[in-house]
Structures are given as structure tokens and as C-alpha cells.
């Protein structure tokens, strides 16, 4: 189970993980105390038949070719959490692990 | 965490789970002993901003809008295994649980 890593200038056409730094301050998300920025990454690229397919199911749907199935797309296949300090809706400061905030691997599903 | 369920006649445009029965015999996959057919389901539909987004990360990437990011797509967000009886490459009969063979829920990621 592997995935490609690319940089933002790469001409790679296949499904790949690209670097992306999310800046909460730039978004105006002032309820987030820390971190102000973090490396989130994102997935982009084409999912040609079979390349980087995460599940056998993806292959089976392609073979069955039901109406409306758009083929696999490039999406996170492994994600990890980050620890965050933030205000909740009641203006209380919360420290917690927020799941699925960082893309570790991309694939076709 | 929920997902829409549709049938094959539905006019729903959003990301939805549709029924699909995979027929191994019809595919000519004669190394599979049992089951000969199973309900696999598949995901199809549009991922308008925010609808059925599985991760906060999806929202953040949309907001950052990096070059080449194609927006979220409709993909399995929960899958389950099935038990299968099949011949492996050495012609041995194997009984095992094959992961991610059934789509239980669809979402946008």
C-alpha cells in the first residue's frame, strides 16, 4: 500500500499527495488558538484504471460498470490527527486531538 | 456521520450509495468458489461544497484552493469485509475475510 508524493510544480498526472500548509489566521478562523498553521497536504491527480486502487471493490465496480459510476477518484487513503487548542461554542478553551486533519497517503477509490 | 442511500431509479444528484450486485461468474472469475455473487454497492453523485464531507480537512483544502485540487468526490467512507472461499495462486483453497468489499456508506472527501 503506497502512494506517490509530488511537489506543487510537478507535472505528474497520476493521483499524488501534494504539500499544503493551512493557515487558520488567513482564513479568519480566530477560534483556533494553536496551531495557527499546519501542514495538511492534499490529493490531486487522475485515477486511471488500476493505478493506486486502494480496494478490490474499486476494480469490481469498474468491471461491472453500473450506470452513473464515475470511476475512482484521487482521495486520502491514510490520514492522521493533530492536537489543537481552540474555543468551543461555549467560549471554553479545549485541548484535543482532531482526527483526519493531515493527509499521509493518497490513492484511488 | 451519515450517508444517503438511493436506488437505481433515483433522481438524487448528490453523493449517494447505490445498490450493485457483483457476479463473479459473469466476470469469468472462476477462482472464486463462494460466494458466486454478492451485494457490493457503489458510490455516485455530486459533491457540492460541504455536503456529506467526511473530514474537516476536505473543507480546509476547498478554502485554501491549491492549484490542481479538483474538489471533493463521492467515495466510500465506510466499508465492510465479506468471507470468501477461493483458490490462491498455488491452487490451494483459502477461506478468508476479504476487507473493503462492501460499501456501507458514501461521502465526499
Amino acid at each position: 500500500d503506497f502512494g506517490l508524493d509530488c511537489d506543487e510544480h510537478s507535472t505528474e498526472s497520476r493521483c499524488c499527495r501534494y504539500p499544503l500548509t493551512v493557515d487558520f489566521e488567513a482564513f479568519g478562523w480566530d477560534w483556533i488558538i494553536a496551531p495557527k498553521r499546519y501542514k495538511a497536504n492534499y490529493c490531486s491527480g487522475e485515477c486511471e484504471f488500476v493505478f493506486l486502487q486502494k480496494y478490490p471493490h474499486t476494480h469490481l465496480v469498474h468491471q461491472a460498470n453500473p450506470r452513473g459510476s464515475a470511476g475512482p477518484c484521487c482521495t486520502p487513503t491514510k490520514m492522521s490527527p493533530i492536537n489543537m487548542l481552540y474555543f468551543n461554542g461555549k467560549e471554553q478553551i479545549i485541548y484535543g486531538k482532531i482526527p483526519a486533519m493531515v493527509v499521509d497517503r493518497c490513492g484511488c477509490s | 456521520d451519515f450517508g444517503l442511500d438511493c436506488d437505481e431509479h433515483s433522481t438524487e444528484s448528490r453523493c449517494c450509495r447505490y445498490p450493485l450486485t457483483v457476479d463473479f461468474e459473469a466476470f469469468g472469475w472462476d477462482w472464486i468458489i463462494a460466494p458466486k455473487r454478492y451485494k457490493a454497492n457503489y458510490c455516485s453523485g455530486e459533491c457540492e461544497f460541504v455536503f456529506l464531507q467526511k473530514y474537516p480537512h476536505t473543507h480546509l483544502v476547498h478554502q485554501a484552493n491549491p492549484r490542481g485540487s479538483a474538489g471533493p468526490c463521492c467515495t466510500p467512507t465506510k466499508m465492510s469485509p465479506i468471507n470468501m472461499l477461493y483458490f490462491n495462486g498455488k491452487e490451494q483453497i483459502i477461506y478468508g475475510k476479504i476487507p473493503a468489499m462492501v460499501v456501507d456508506r458514501c461521502g465526499c472527501s
Epitope: 510544480h9 510537478s10 507535472t11 505528474e12 498526472s13 497520476r14 490531486s44 491527480g45 487522475e46 | 479538483a70
Partner: antibody, heavy 122, light 107 residues
């Protein structure tokens, strides 16, 4: 035989718009990324834009970003370049070029059209 | 942006002789380099891709080599139809960039 035929060029004034077309034949159009490359009179080649086979991925040169829009109609085997806010420096022969798919990188052109001349002048 | 620099700008060669054209990238482009040939009033034509692979229908007298940042195109025993402008082009990074061209003219 692969054929690419550009059309839509002509003389326009600065600030005006023009839409170029490239009619493709001889290959499965939807399976290949397509490109526009231009050449100013007496000058070298300059890449303008690339669009993936599905149309889902699009890339532009900084010099045209925000003014030019690449698109494709796979049902008509046609590539387009909508050029707005044209400037004198956009004067060039515009070639459409097919991506080769010799490897997984965009931008390797194996067939080129003959080009269409765009002149921007007052 | 990766800058592609070709040298010489003009190369004067007699028919039947060998011509060697140089192309240098300002940063590593791996093997994602192509060579195109263009005659006056015509469209470019792909000669070489992936640094050294000849495109379909390209004669064996054309060969190319290099890696990373330094590349070369060699034309053995120049024929009359080989007198043209040659462009190198990298397709490793956006934006795609071409060299300024080398004009191969009859000596």
C-alpha cells in the same frame, strides 16, 4: 492518422476577445491531455495552457492566467481557448498540441497542429 | 520557473557532417526532456522524448543523451531536411518551458 486543425484566429484590438478551436481526429480524444502553445513572430515557443483528458485538471502560464480559459468538448473532439482582455504581446501563432502519454507526466507533445495566427493591434 | 538555455544559438554545418546541440536546465528536470524540430512556416515536430527516446518515424541519425540539467542532441550525417530550428523542452515542472532554440544552417 492524428490530425489537429486550429481555427478562430484573426485580427483584434487590445482588450477584445477571441475564441480558438482545435478539431482533433485519429485518436481517442478523451484519453489524452491537450495543450496550447504559442509562438510570437520570429520568436521561440511558449507554453500557454494544458487540460487533462477528462477536463478535471487545468494549468496555465502566469502570463495568461485570469485572462485565458482552456476547455474541451470530448463529445465533439474539440479543444478550445477563450482569450479575453487581449494584449499586443499575445500576438502569436497558436498551436494546439496533443499530449503523448509516453509517461505519466503532462506536457510531452507528440503531435502539433499547423497553428492559427492571432494578431492584437490597434 | 525552470529556464532552458540552448547553445549555440546558430550552428553552421555542412551536409553529411555531425551537429551537436546543447541544452541546459536551471534545475533538475530528471529525464523529462524533449527535443522538437521546426522548419519555417511549419508546426514543430517531436523528435526525442524522455531525454533519449526517438519518436515514431524519427531516423536513427538523431540521438540524444543527458540527465538532470545537461542534455545534448546529436545529428549524424546531416541531410538537407535537417536544416531547421531545434527546441529543447522540459516537462518535469509547471510551467512547461522551452529553450530559445538552435538554428542549424547550411555552411
Amino acid at each position: 492518422e492524428v490530425q489537429l486543425l486550429e481555427s478562430g484566429g484573426g485580427l483584434v484590438q487590445p482588450g477584445e476577445s477571441l475564441r480558438l478551436s482545435c478539431a482533433a481526429s485519429g485518436f481517442t480524444f478523451s484519453s489524452y491531455a491537450m495543450n496550447w502553445v504559442r509562438q510570437a513572430p520570429g520568436k521561440g515557443l511558449e507554453w500557454v495552457s494544458t487540460i487533462s483528458g477528462s477536463g478535471g485538471y487545468i494549468y496555465y502560464a502566469d502570463s495568461v492566467k485570469g485572462r485565458f480559459t482552456i476547455s474541451r468538448d470530448n463529445s465533439k473532439n474539440t479543444l478550445y481557448l477563450q482569450m479575453n482582455s487581449l494584449r499586443a504581446e499575445d500576438t502569436a501563432v497558436y498551436f494546439c498540441a496533443k499530449d503523448s502519454r509516453y509517461n505519466w507526466n503532462y506536457g510531452n507533445f507528440d503531435y502539433w497542429g499547423q497553428g492559427t495566427l492571432v494578431t492584437v493591434s490597434s | 520557473e525552470i529556464v532552458m538555455t540552448q547553445s549555440p544559438a546558430t550552428l553552421s554545418v555542412s551536409p553529411g557532417e555531425r551537429a551537436t546541440l546543447s541544452c541546459r536546465a536551471s534545475q533538475n528536470v530528471s529525464s523529462n526532456l524533449a527535443w522538437n524540430k521546426q522548419k519555417p512556416g511549419q508546426a514543430p515536430r517531436l523528435l526525442i522524448y524522455a531525454t533519449s527516446t526517438r519518436a515514431t518515424g524519427v531516423p536513427a541519425r538523431f540521438s540524444a543523451s543527458g540527465s538532470g540539467t545537461d542534455f545534448a542532441l546529436t545529428i549524424n550525417s546531416l541531410q538537407s531536411e535537417d536544416f531547421a530550428v531545434y527546441y529543447c523542452q522540459q516537462y518535469n515542472n509547471w510551467p512547461l518551458t522551452f529553450g530559445g532554440g538552435t538554428k542549424v544552417e547550411i555552411k
